[in-house]
Interface confidence: medium
């Protein structure tokens, strides 16, 4: 067993590790979410720029200093283009999120065009249809019971929009949608210990060809892709959606990661690689937005004054646009966008951010030199709740995102989508589908706490992403009954 004196020898301060678990006992035993553990570690050494920690038995560096973060994520990005997640590239492993730097470059170049303004405008009507169906469903349910568990409810909306926008699938029946959701839920919630194994023995999963994804999930995405490829006769259909792009890549046969097209760094587009991209788009498109919207609704229930301001803004904008929600009106709603940003400050979904050094690297402003292959971690949650950057950080306050307030803050003090070249490719899609749905909800309902609303909401320890423990229960009151 490796000894825990790695950081001591290098004069890097950090918390005392425990045998076997290092500093991650609570997350390894699923008592706390990894993001929460990282936030706690961040808070232990408020004066340090970097903290030496152990993920199980592997030494890693938790970076606190925002200038250092800027170097890692932006200025010295070429050293940190890898996320450092090592497992089998088979079975969904070569997806855009988990891919190594070279694979990511090859794929990222191709997928960035999916999220241009033009493409998002085209997708908007599909999102709109999904949002209308969702509101109809909520209205019908409301007649029976005004209390909802909004996290799992909103997953039905985001599942519809990602299925329609990315794959051209229409889930006609709620039953089909729920079946798909139940399968995809497994990837987010089944406690796989493969990640911990990788922390103890980096590269082992890759060597043993082990995946971190359940077989049932792999099979679901394989049949999903097979069906769509068959429906479109293996050729792009002209919808210009994610699947068309995938089919174009399939016809190409390979993509290269550099602009000169040297085959030394090309990636063969196998059906397995296609499945992996379908998987990451599905997961990233549905779970993150559903969780963000659920947390936003929770905060609006607890902060009626803010909700009133938002409802006034929604009503005003809709009145000026004949009651229609358009791509442009969503962007126009300044206070709504600020409330969304504040939600992501309080509930950054992907925690922690992770990068791997591709060579030895001296941490700027310190004497610390990290070795090649060292994992570097950043805790958005730690930063977002740091009173140094945000006054009264536990208070939901959209005004923090007034332009002048944002201008006063360090650019790395807000990291819900990561930063730099390898930030979240779908952040504009996520914002659009979320704000459209929230607009529709607020135009029809007022959100209030129910008798079962948890005022002390905890983070679910079993999920890989940040999410509400036990869901979020609130009442949706039709506004015609309120006014």
């Amino acid at each position: 067993m490796r000894t825990f004196n790695y950081w001591k020898k290098r004069n890097v301060r950090g918390p005392e590790p425990v045998v076997f678990f290092g500093n991650l006992k609570d997350s390894a035993l699923r008592k706390k979410n990894m993001g929460v553990v990282m936030e706690e570690l961040y808070n232990m050494f408020p004066e340090e720029k970097v903290i030496g920690i152990y993920r199980m038995t592997s030494p890693c560096l938790l970076v606190r200093d925002l200038d250092v973060i800027k170097h890692i994520m932006i200025k010295d990005f070429e050293v940190f283009s890898d996320r450092g997640v090592e497992f089998s590239k088979e079975g969904l492993g070569s997806n855009l999120f988990h891919a190594d730097g070279e694979t990511w470059r090859a794929l990222g170049n191709r997928f960035t065009p999916i999220f241009t303004s033009g493409k998002l405008k085209n997708m908007f009507y599909l999102m709109h249809e999904g949002a209308d169906n969702f509101i109809d469903h909520v209205s019908a349910e409301c007649e029976k019971n005004q209390e909802f568990e909004v996290h799992s409810l909103l997953q039905t909306y985001t599942m519809s929009t990602i299925a329609a926008c990315a794959f051209g699938i229409s889930y006609d029946s709620i039953g089909d949608k729920v079946k798909a959701l139940d399968i995809v839920d497994k990837i987010i919630s089944e406690p796989s210990y493969a990640i911990e194994l990788d922390m103890m023995y980096p590269g082992l999963l890759s060597k043993l060809n082990l995946s971190i994804f359940p077989t049932v999930v792999k099979n679901f995405f394989k049949s999903l892709v097979d069906n769509i490829v068959a429906q479109r006769n293996g050729k792009p259909s002209g919808r210009n959606d994610f699947m068309d792009l995938i089919l174009e890549l399939r016809q190409l046969g390979e993509v290269t990661s550099n602009k000169y097209g040297s085959s030394a760094s090309s990636l063969e587009i196998t059906d397995e690689v296609i499945c992996a991209q379908a998987f990451v788009f599905y997961i990233a498109g549905y779970e993150t937005s559903a969780t963000t919207m659920a947390y936003m609704i929770y905060q609006l229930a607890l902060n009626p004054d803010i909700q009133n301001k938002l409802i006034a803004e929604v009503d005003e904008v809709l009145k000026a646009n004949d009651g229609k929600v358009t791509y442009d009106t969503v962007k126009e709603m300044k206070y709504l966008n600020k409330a969304f940003d504040e939600t992501l400050r309080m509930y950054s979904i992907v925690e922690p951010l992770q990068r791997k050094a591709t060579r030895d690297y001296k941490i700027p402003g310190t004497d610390v030199v990290i070795e090649k292959d060292t994992i570097v971690l950043i805790s958005p949650r730690g930063i977002h709740y740091d009173p140094k950057y945000y006054d009264n950080p536990k208070q939901f306050n959209p005004d923090r995102f007034d332009a002048e307030e944002v201008g006063k803050r360090h650019p790395c003090a807000y990291l819900p989508f990561g930063l730099g070249q390898r930030n979240c490719i779908g952040m504009r899609f996520g914002r659009l589908q979320s704000l459209l749905c929230i607009t529709k909800i607020l135009s029809k309902f007022r959100i209030e706490p129910s008798k079962n609303t948890d005022r002390n909401l905890q983070v679910e320890p079993h999920r890989g992403l940040i999410g509400p423990k036990g869901g979020i229960r609130v009442n949706a009151i039709p506004r015609k009954l309120v006014s």
Epitope: E147, F148, S152, Q155, D185, S189, R463, K469, G471, R473
Partner: nanobody
């Protein structure tokens, strides 16, 4: 239709513990989550705990946190409720119920099982 059958109730001394079971049959794929409710004499029926089949997401009401544990066995289509440190105030009829995703309208109900705690 989803059929639900509770079992495990009975007379217990204060401080003791009990494990209630709820077996689901029929079109269980329609059910996203199962909840345990209780109704004490002369009181409203209250939700005490809820668990989702697919992702194991668990909810407890504040009144029972720490003493009640809900769990599921997907292979057996059964949900359990373990109650520790029973108090006379836990005396009630305990019902299990099933709900769809996102709603808190429990649409299928069991017959209930009586739990009596004697001091």
């Amino acid at each position: 239709q989803v059929q639900l059958q509770e079992s495990g109730g009975g007379l217990v001394q204060a401080g003791g513990s009990l494990r209630l079971s709820c077996a689901a049959s029929g079109r269980t794929s329609r059910s996203y989550a199962m909840g345990w409710f209780r109704q004490a004499p002369g009181k409203e029926r209250e939700l005490v705990a809820d668990i989702a089949w697919s992702d194991g997401r668990i909810y407890y009401s504040d009144s029972v946190k720490g003493r009640f544990t809900i769990s599921r066995d997907n292979a057996k289509n059964t949900v359990y409720l373990e109650i520790d440190s029973l108090k006379p105030g836990d005396t009630a009829v305990y019902y299990c119920a099933s709900r769809a995703r996102g709603t808190v309208s429990y649409n299928y109900w069991g017959q209930g099982t009586q739990v009596t705690v004697s001091s």
